[in-house]
Amino acid sequence: LQDLCSNCPAGTFCDNNRSQICSPCPPNSFSSAGGQRTCDICRQCKGVFKTRKECSSTSNAECDCISGYHCLGAECSMCEQDCKQGQELTKKGCKDCCFGTFNDQKRGICRPWTNCSLDGKSVLVNGTKERDVVCGPSPADLSPGASSATPPAPAR
């Protein structure tokens, strides 16, 4: 006996109560593949989640976070509070980065400034809460008599 359900396309389900007729998915449900015996309820973007893509009969809704929050987890399953650059999120909210650390994003943790001396270089631009240090040439390259710049190209 041929399984008539395999003929039911995405967006429908095989209705056993109606002699395996392909019935459209009810409102607020979807089937993303053919041959399904039920349609799945759509994901609801509620609360801190906002709808990025509406549910259709063939695809689930996709959620995003409201302004001031960013997505975490698979399929944006959580929303984490944004902080300013130069801050990190703690249990008590957004806190400024400690001296010697920086964060150039609205999310994530404060990271230590680069230690230029580990690469034998010197600090060209000091770090801030929002920016890492910029490492320059090694101190030896900056000693008197050493050329610290590329000589100009000869005039034509």
Partner: antibody
Framework: EVQLVESGGGLVQPGGSLRLSCAAS??????????VGWIRQAPGKGLEWLAL???????YYSPSLKSRLTISRDNSKNTLYLQLNSLRAEDTAVYYC???????????????WGQGTLVTVSS | DIQLTQSPSSLSASVGDRVTITCRAS??????LAWYQQKPGKAPKLLIY???SLESGVPSRFSGSGSGTDFTLTISSLQPEDFATYYC????????FGQGTKVEIK
């Protein structure tokens, strides 16, 4: 520190109505991202979600109880309310107020709960 | 509505035992699943959210796993204070709870 304190429970006649309150402290009901709801538990039974209201006044109700429930809030008092009409014996339960999400990560779970208020529907 | 079915409904275990509770959803709710612990006369306490994230302050002997329709709460070494009722909860579409699993002393 986040705190939720429910009140308004007691003995109610069948067919009557009740209005429960939940006083929130340690956070504002109108803070962006915050949702607070009601969950009940009949004696010796499991948990049943009833309703939730968002910071921006979006309301969500349990489909099976939607016609009898009204959730609301008063931002000036930082207080949440639940009105339940046409009460029946099976509405006898402890009613909990709960806040969605955790401290800095928000999602569809409840990290903060009140101590609950007992509602008894009986003649 | 999305239904959540917990198994077993109750179990008896001893201190030090490894305990596993399962929660099956009527359709995929991944990863919008949380676990709670409730003791008599007390409000539920959040243990796990997002299927596997441990709530702050919850002992590391509690862990959550699973995806799609099948989820598990594991207590690696049962302690005296862990005897309680445990509930799963989905937040994928509205909110629903499982019927609960009572963990009793053997």
């Amino acid at each position: 520190e986040v705190q939720l304190v429910e009140s308004g429970g007691g003995l109610v006649q069948p067919g009557g109505s009740l209005r429960l309150s939940c006083a929130a402290s340690g956070f504002s009901l109108s803070t962006s991202g915050v949702g607070v709801g009601w969950i009940r538990q009949a004696p010796g039974k499991g948990l049943e979600w009833l309703a939730l209201i968002d910071w921006d006044d979006d309301k969500y109700y349990s489909p099976s109880l939607k016609s009898r429930l009204t959730i609301s809030r008063d931002n000036s008092k930082n207080t949440l309310y639940l009105q339940l009409n046409s009460l029946r014996a099976e509405d006898t339960a402890v009613y909990y107020c709960a806040r969605g999400g955790s401290d800095t990560v928000l999602g569809d779970w409840f990290a903060y709960w009140g101590q609950g208020t007992l509602v008894t529907v009986s003649s | 509505d999305i239904q959540l079915t917990q198994s077993p409904s109750s179990l008896s275990a001893s201190v030090g035992d490894r305990v596993t509770i399962t929660c099956r959803a009527s359709q995929s709710v991944s990863p919008y699943l949380a676990w709670y612990q409730q003791k008599p006369g007390k409000a539920p306490k959040l243990l796990i959210y997002d299927a596997s994230s441990l709530e702050s302050g919850v002992p590391s002997r509690f862990s959550g796993s699973g995806s799609g329709t099948d989820f598990t709460l594991t207590i690696s070494s049962l302690q005296p204070e862990d005897f309680a009722t445990y509930y799963c909860q989905q937040g994928y579409s509205l909110w629903t709870f499982g019927q609960g699993t009572k963990v009793e002393i053997k």
